[in-house]
Amino acid sequence: TQNKALPENVKYGIVLDAGSSHTSLYIYKWPAEKENDTGVVHQVEECRVKGPGISKFVQKVNEIGIYLTDCMERAREVIPRSQHQETPVYLGATAGMRLLRMESEELADRVLDVVERSLSNYPFDFQGARIITGQEEGAYGWITINYLLGKFSQKTRWFSIVPYETNNQETFGALDLGGASTQVTFVPQNQTIESPDNALQFRLYGKDYNVYTHSFLCYGKDQALWQKLAKDIQVASNEILRDPCFHPGYKKVVNVSDLYKTPCTKRFEMTLPFQQFEIQGIGNYQQCHQSILELFNTSYCPYSQCAFNGIFLPPLQGDFGAFSAFYFVMKFLNLTSEKVSQEKVTEMMKKFCAQPWEEIKTSYAGVKEKYLSEYCFSGTYILSLLLQGYHFTADSWEHIHFIGKIQGSDAGWTLGYMLNLTNMIPAEQPLSTPLSHSTYV
């Protein structure tokens, strides 16, 4: 008799990351009987929705359904039909929507309402769309990378199954850079977390974790650039802004109304004698770095130690995974190697920013000009943020690991979010009795 293959006993979950610049849909899969084991959930698909972030649809909310269709259809194709009804779908919106909510709670609610109605039309088990807090974004990113790195597993191994893994169970810190915010999350070494807003307590797999986290709204790479432009145009003598963060020969016209559209530039807003100005790149890393530092207020700190803008930051501890735009930007600049020192990174950035725009366009013909033009700023911003903002040094730089994926799953908050909402991270070791919802993260 022929052996019949038993149907795979697997489960699926979908998380949509509604970021400030785009939306991505992630499909996760895990063996049903191993739900509480660590490291069993993995990503089977990422579908990047074509177009901008959902906050851009504020004036045409009725089109959000059209925008989401292709990736939701992709999910229908990837997940077996028999599993559709039991596959949970979550949408978490991050800093782009936090900013929209700051401008108008009504508009943000309207966008989310249409998102919810659109996603409810699919055959999956839609669980809701919400704007997650910056604290959640940091926490779930930290959970994701440590889950994927096997840090919550109690079994010590003499061999390494994942990159960056040391044999100890010391967790990695998480550094996340988006378009509108950036998060820093880690377990400090025997240090009191002086500000309660930045403290998280978890019990995961039978172990307690005291975690520090902070999300800096307006300090994602796109909003930081708007901030820098708004700051610099204040002191420009006319409608030409000679900008060291863009390549020599680069030119771009910016509408003042676009500059002041975001809440992130409000502190620099002033009446200008022109409606438009032209950015003219001069490509100077050092001057760009200096200009960026002016965005960080380090003159005031009500704690023993601060990052910037009066926000408490404990001394850095252990290794860090830097993901999302930290990774994408450094990957483009070819600076993700563990062997590249901070001094070397700075040297490479100086060379890159000084390259003429025409030369850059030729060298990177397949890259969208809008993105291409901003890598000098973004790379410089990453260095400034990590070194001056978070106080990494040339020595501690080697503890930063620029990570895109771990074991085939993207580093980011979405996996941690799903693990939490599906109760797949038990507080105690899985051998213990089932726990109530309240014992989960």
Epitope: K50, G51, P52, K56, E63, I66, Y67
Partner: antibody, heavy 121, light 111 residues
């Protein structure tokens, strides 16, 4: 501004193969789908298929599947339509097109100028 | 495959009048609360141009005199008032499911 430049007119014999290119400038093809549409002389439009250049997923009208191949090179922002085992009824103008949402949530459509393919013995 | 039927095949009208073009699908093109019907305009020797997407949304840079309506299987493109550059062939297209099919077209000519 966005431009789609297609390769020049082709005259081919039945049974032969041809590869038509569509070079996009001012836009990254990874950020949208590339569609191919054809129009036989004096006739209506026929949708051939589309590609998502970000992950090379393709979808075809089943009547073109197998004989037609759509590919994309994101490093040069160029999409290709390859036709094999050509027949006289493949004589048509072939268009590449992009449509979708831009960074400001405006729905765009951009078309190539068309490539005339003539299949004749 | 979803078959689209357009009527009339030819429509003769004068400048300033209202044009009403119809497209009927062999089955519903609605899904997930969206009507996946698009309208294109094509002039001789030119590629098509998207006028309306998802039944009623105007394409980028399309004048307000073009409007689309309908759901399920019956859709309409209205042009009012007609201007000289509007005389062309109009195609409907469904994008609910592969293959995305086009209708046979309606020729709008100057009376």
């Amino acid at each position: 501004q966005v431009q789609l430049q297609q390769s020049g007119a082709e005259l081919k014999k039945p049974g032969a193969s041809v590869k038509i290119s569509c070079k996009v400038s001012g836009f990254s093809i990874k950020d949208t789908y590339v569609h191919w549409v054809r129009q036989p002389p004096g006739k209506g439009l026929e949708w051939i298929g589309k590609i998502d250049p970000a992950n090379v997923n393709t979808k075809f009208d089943p009547k073109f599947q197998g004989r037609f191949t759509i590919t994309a090179d994101t490093s040069t922002d160029t999409a290709y339509l390859e036709l094999s085992s050509l027949r006289s009824e493949d004589t048509a103008v072939y268009y590449c097109a992009l449509y979708g949402y831009d960074d400001d949530a405006y729905y765009f459509d951009y078309w190539g100028q068309g490539t005339m393919l003539t299949v004749s013995s | 495959d979803i078959v689209l039927t357009q009527s009339p095949a030819t429509l003769s009208l004068s400048l300033g009048q209202r044009a009403t073009l119809s497209c009927r699908a062999s089955e519903s093109v609605d899904n997930y609360g969206i009507s996946f019907m698009n309208w294109f305009q094509q002039k001789p020797g030119q590629p098509p141009r998207l006028l309306i997407y998802a039944a009623s949304n105007q394409g980028s840079g399309i004048p307000a005199r073009f409007s689309g309506s309908g759901s399920g299987t019956d859709f309409t493109l209205n042009i009012t008032p007609l201007e000289s550059e509007d005389f062309a062939v109009y195609y409907c297209q469904q994008s609910k499911e592969v293959p995305y099919t086009f209708g046979p077209g309606t020729k709008l000519e100057l009376k």
